[in-house]
Amino acid sequence: EDELQVIQPEKSVSVAAGESATLRCAMTSLIPVGPIMWFRGAGAGRELIYNQKEGHFPRVTTVSELTKRNNLDFSISISNITPADAGTYYCVKFRKGSPDDVEFKSGAGTELSVRAKPS
């Protein structure tokens, strides 16, 4: 069976301040079992934007129903975008582990740029 791939189809997304940004991500397989997370930036200093497993992320909604059986779409929408939200967003698949989940594979990233709010 082919190994899971993380698909982020857009290289870049541009959104006006105050609007919502949709960041698209999908998996090619349901295996391995484990959550997905979204981060802004890469490396040790990356910022957690969304965790499928736990946490409260008031500005983030999932585009499709993540609890739906066989769902492979892990796209998110971030509301009320500000210039501070600019950066590169990574969709990351984790493999279920004990005691901690282990990072399995990351998407290529989508750069979010923020335009000035139309006057």
């Epitope: 189809p9 090619t28 492979l72």
Partner: antibody, heavy 125, light 107 residues
Framework: QVQLVQSGAEVKKPGSSVKVSCKAS????????ISWVRQAPGQGLEWMGG????????NYAQKFQGRVTITADESTSTAYMELSSLRSEDTAVYYC??????????????????WGQGTTVTVSS | DIQMTQSPSSVSASVGDRVTITCRAS??????LAWYQQKPGKAPKLLIY???SLQSGVPSRFSGSGSGTDFTLTISSLQPEDFATYYC?????????FGGGTKVEIK
């Protein structure tokens, strides 16, 4: 070898709709990006929109927003483009083309490397 | 939407000539640009992707360069089969957009 085979030529009346199909063979259809591009007689290429079946939703060029609907049926590996409220300026050759997918490492910016044969749509009263 | 402007709109050249076509994006697109060749009555053919990567099977006389907003397609020594129309396309962000095309004609 991946192929895209489109439905045949259509003649339509102004105000009506047309639905063109594009059947893919080979490759993993769900992760391909299928774009629709049109070319009016003597004119350049226009990207109308595209869909990646695994996501379900399509992206559209602003010019066609509200008038074009792009869908995909994973069970038959077929993409569809429906254009409504047809006018004479919609007379063109309509192409489907693929990018991304497993063959490219899921890189959708690697260009549209396989094209359908084109479908001529003529809008005339 | 990102606008793509190609120049010239047409060029007359002879076999063996070096031909250069330019494409400018209305905003930065990194190197996410493709070039296509189209002959009358035929579907377009992908020549170059990621601004400078040659598509498999395309002759090495075709080359691409550039990043950001300014890009170039060069045919180093024009062959009879190269007389066609060439289009650039940005694939950085949706909606993808094409340039207006450059027709390479026989002088």
């Amino acid at each position: 070898q991946v192929q895209l085979v489109q439905s045949g030529a259509e003649v339509k009346k102004p105000g009506s709709s047309v639905k063109v199909s594009c059947k893919a063979s080979g490759g993993t259809f769900s992760s391909l990006a299928i774009s629709w591009v049109r070319q009016a007689p003597g004119q350049g290429l226009e990207w109308m929109g595209g869909i990646i079946p695994i996501f379900g939703t399509a992206n559209y060029a602003q010019k066609f927003q509200g008038r074009v609907t792009i869908t995909a049926d994973e069970s038959t590996s077929t993409a569809y483009m429906e254009l409504s409220s047809l006018r004479s300026e919609d007379t063109a050759v309509y192409y489907c083309a693929r990018s991304g997918g497993d063959y490219s490492g899921y890189d959708y910016a690697s260009g549209m490397d396989v094209w359908g044969q084109g479908t001529t749509v003529t809008v005339s009263s | 939407d990102i606008q793509m402007t190609q120049s010239p709109s047409s060029v007359s050249a002879s076999v063996g000539d070096r031909v250069t076509i330019t494409c400018r994006a209305s905003q930065g697109i990194s190197s996410w640009l493709a070039w296509y060749q189209q002959k009358p009555g035929k579907a377009p053919k992908l020549l170059i992707y990621a601004a400078s990567s040659l598509q498999s099977g395309v002759p090495s006389r075709f080359s691409g360069s550039g990043s950001g907003t300014d890009f170039t397609l060069t045919i180093s020594s024009l062959q009879p089969e190269d007389f066609a129309t060439y289009y650039c396309q940005q694939v950085n962000s949706f909606p993808w957009t094409f340039g207006g095309g450059t027709k390479v004609e026989i002088k």
